[in-house]
Interface confidence: low
Amino acid sequence: DAHKSEVAHRFKDLGEENFKALVLIAFAQYLQQCPFEDHVKLVNEVTEFAKTCVADESAENCDKSLHTLFGDKLCTVATLRETYGEMADCCAKQEPERNECFLQHKDDNPNLPRLVRPEVDVMCTAFHDNEETFLKKYLYEIARRHPYFYAPELLFFAKRYKAAFTECCQAADKAACLLPKLDELRDEGKASSAKQRLKCASLQKFGERAFKAWAVARLSQRFPKAEFAEVSKLVTDLTKVHTECCHGDLLECADDRADLAKYICENQDSISSKLKECCEKPLLEKSHCIAEVENDEMPADLPSLAADFVESKDVCKNYAEAKDVFLGMFLYEYARRHPDYSVVLLLRLAKTYETTLEKCCAAADPHECYAKVFDEFKPLVEEPQNLIKQNCELFEQLGEYKFQNALLVRYTKKVPQVSTPTLVEVSRNLGKVGSKCCKHPEAKRMPCAEDYLSVVLNQLCVLHEKTPVSDRVTKCCTESLVNRRPCFSALEVDETYVPKEFNAETFTFHADICTLSEKERQIKKQTALVELVKHKPKATKEQLKAVMDDFAAFVEKCCKADDKETCFAEEGKKLVAASQAALGL
């Protein structure tokens, strides 16, 4: 399948529009601080070059790898050293080290201004004036803020973004039409980015085997009627797609994802009965739909797992002959029978099974040794079930905002060294598990909750990795991918933490809080709550609740006052004094 010119091959496969969009995403994900215009110029140069290679694959430099071509182009940026510092040193390296170097400098939390949404009329004018630039700008702004965003999926978001403006900018009430659609895309985009970030972390930090295990479990739940060989083929192809995207090989990734969607749709009879609707859609929608498709019904009368994996006398023989294939079959068979389990739980069970076989197949009587292996699964299954039950009860009692606050206190006490913005962001997201998952019947709670928590805790891990401050976070993040959530759950209050010095400035508020949205106001209050816990880690729930209630009353009072700023200054001093007294500071 070798091509004389890789760049020509991808240009022809993807078409000019997708080629340009993907190159822009790739460049923006690497050079996150570069101005839009600089990226557009680079993309246009690459596109013109690709066209010369399409015309003549033997033309000069057309035989170079995409990493070489793109890396050379990125290294022409004049301000590389002053903007990016040591990242400029990457340009002294040869491929593939140069690309690895660029990847290592991707920043999960770039110092970029928050995206402020202009007035609807302003956006519609910009859209009509230059639709192409408007959409490119969307790709650029998302890609630079989310350097691991799944590129082919970002094309799907851009298509929906365009459709929203096309429809709404000619509606009678543009804002009523457009704003909910943009909110929807923003929320879905954040969720999509976080899910993909976990896939990349899984591949990059724990390796291909870890990712493949995850994929076997998830695809077996989703396609329980598919045979093991079919699931294995899909896993291999899916791993290639995500390895490419996570590695910055976005053209190859998008091309291979399209091929995978084509294969799935051509073979849906042997994969899943739920794919029909997805497969009637255009490419981007089709791929998205397949990725989100609901689980197929389990085949009737599946035999007991024990026969092949416990009772059979050939267990050790089969395991010894091909360990990963046998474990893969175990995972496949267990997962297809258990759509009610989270993927991470299924992986814990497979790990327990593997550990047992490693020990028992070397024992005098292997069968006697592993006969009770399924009994070891019971506590592993019950732990997340009990945790979800307890937390859903708490969520139903408190509601989302107060549930988030409970988690803020819990996690600040566990890892108080973590920065306040990170604790607020992560705890708010952890708290959303309540409204996302607790309303579901028992059979659907665990896959919803625990797999969502894996995504959120990965956000904590990647943010913490940039500036490590807590050995406990590092330990939970690096020891085991599938045990991250149990590791964080098991953390108690950090007794070694020295409380932060009290700083009145942290608790000084101004009238601008009154004009904030409800969400932003919540974040302000939650930021104050984290700071309180950092000052007084031993504060009781009742003490913290009293201070937070006072704080809410203070904000409400001053926002109703005629002279808001004076109220915030005077009442704020009283609040700080009262809070210090309440907490014994």
Partner: nanobody, 123 residues
């Protein structure tokens, strides 16, 4: 407290029409995708239709395409299900549900549920 209250169910002859409504309170309605599910006696609950937060995206199960129409009024915090050419197999308890994100199929993507309204189609 979040409440989803369905209304409009009843008994109708095959070939007839019904319009179900679902009034939402206690949530920011325009921030939620909405869906209608149904559960016939002795059967699993199945998604019938759903509509995205802005109303720009809709989903219909094969069994109702061309007969049912979902719409929403964000100003009134209400989602509607217009059911035409009803068949006896449409008989079920119809539930309204709300999802934080555009929900692509899994029941567990829906965060809030109504109590249901009964639709009985006689032949």
């Amino acid at each position: 407290d979040v409440q989803l209250v369905e209304s409009g169910g009843g008994v109708v002859q095959a070939g007839g029409s019904l319009r179900l409504s679902c009034a939402a309170s206690g949530l920011t309605f325009s921030s939620y995708a909405m869906g209608w599910f149904r559960q016939a006696p002795g059967k699993e609950r199945e998604r019938v239709v759903s509509i995205s937060r802005g109303g720009g995206y809709t989903y219909y199960a094969d069994s109702v395409k061309g007969r049912f129409t979902i719409s929403r009024d964000n100003a009134e915090n209400t989602v509607y299900l217009q059911m035409n050419s009803l068949k006896p197999e449409d008989t079920a308890l119809y539930y309204c549900a709300a999802a934080r994100y555009w929900a692509t199929g899994s029941e567990y993507e829906f965060d809030y549920w109504g109590q249901g309204t009964l639709v009985k189609v006689s032949s």
